[in-house]
């Protein structure tokens, strides 16, 4: 649910970390209306997912641990 | 050591509502998701949804949107799933189980099943 | 959503058998399987996360395999407490799908 590269809603699936090849975070105070991460998929899909969902965090955490130990 | 214990055996008319509990043990309840998947007699297991109950986030299985909630009660470490306008195809053995991303969103513990029968 | 297709549906085999179980996705699930062993009576059982990783308590006769959209779980040697119903499932994307179930029964 993108319009512009903003989100304008959130996915209503949950997504498992090996489908997520990275993310983008996007902020309500940055010219879009909500706070959102964009995962972007193995099939070159961009999906809007809710910060707050747990999965959600865990994917981000998942993803950023691994661009840490790169 | 992780329990799940299921609400005992129902038997309901067609186009009632039936609610399974499911109570907690063993591990931090809020850290797990709860997950809800039925077998029907001769049938194959079915995933109906779950809940992650640290936040009360649910995902439903499109089949039973509309049909399907799930709740959770963290003060007894209790997760609910309530099914309503029961049919005859309804009749099965419904699961509670422990969801766990470190097993691959695998389920790693399970309820014994509730036995719900659908009779007119 | 996803579709899981298992096969067989039922087999034959004896105490001591090398079995294969495959079970094929509608896309590429990228790994993101596992597989369940279920007894008459009992709750279902995790036996493989991940395509590839043994869950606790699993024996190592037990092992899977797969990639894309096609996996296998194998038992090395069949043991008598091993004939039961083992299901595949998708947990790649919501809903998670389950294949129809293989039987395994005593020859």
């Known amino acids: 649910a993108s319009n512009f590269d903003c989100c304008l809603g959130y996915t209503d699936r949950i997504l498992h970390p090996k489908f997520i090849v990275g993310f983008t975070r996007q902020l309500a105070n940055e010219g879009c209306d909500i706070n959102a991460i964009i995962f972007h998929t193995k099939k070159k899909l961009s999906v809007c997912a809710n910060p707050k969902q747990t999965w959600v965090k865990y994917i981000v955490r998942l993803l950023s641990k691994k661009v840490k130990n790169m | 050591q992780v329990q799940l214990v299921q609400s005992g055996a129902e038997v309901k008319k067609p186009g009632a509502s039936v609610k399974v509990s499911c109570k907690a043990s063993?591990?931090?309840?809020?850290?797990?998701?709860m997950h809800w998947v039925r077998q029907a007699p001769g049938q194959g297991l079915e995933w109906m949804g779950l809940?992650?109950?640290?936040?009360?986030?649910?995902n439903y299985n499109q089949k039973f949107k509309g049909r399907v909630t799930m709740t959770r009660d963290t003060s007894t470490s209790t997760v609910y799933m309530e099914l309503s306008s029961l049919r005859s195809e309804d009749t099965a053995v419904y699961y509670c189980?422990?969801?766990?991303?470190?097993?691959?969103?695998?389920?790693?513990?399970w309820g014994q099943g509730t036995l719900v029968t659908v009779s007119s | 959503d996803i579709q899981m297709t298992q096969s067989p549906s039922s087999l034959s085999a004896s105490v001591g058998d090398r079995v294969t179980i495959t079970c094929g996705a509608s896309e590429n699930i990228y790994g993101a399987l596992n597989w369940y062993q279920r007894k008459p009576g009992k709750a279902p059982k995790l036996l493989i996360y991940?395509?590839?990783n043994l869950a606790d308590g699993v024996p190592s006769r037990f092992s899977g395999s797969g990639s894309g959209r096609d996996y296998t779980l194998t038992i090395s040697s069949l043991q008598p407490e091993d004939f039961a119903t083992y299901y595949c499932?998708?947990?790649?994307?919501?809903?998670?799908?389950f294949g129809q179930g293989t039987k395994l029964e005593i020859k």
């Open positions: 063993g591990y931090t309840f809020t850290s797990y998701w």
């Open positions: 991940g395509a590839t």
């Open positions: 809940i992650d109950p640290s936040d009360k986030y649910t």
């Open positions: 499932q998708n947990v790649l994307i919501t809903p998670y799908t």
């Open positions: 189980a422990r969801g766990n991303y470190g097993v691959d969103y695998g389920m790693d513990y």
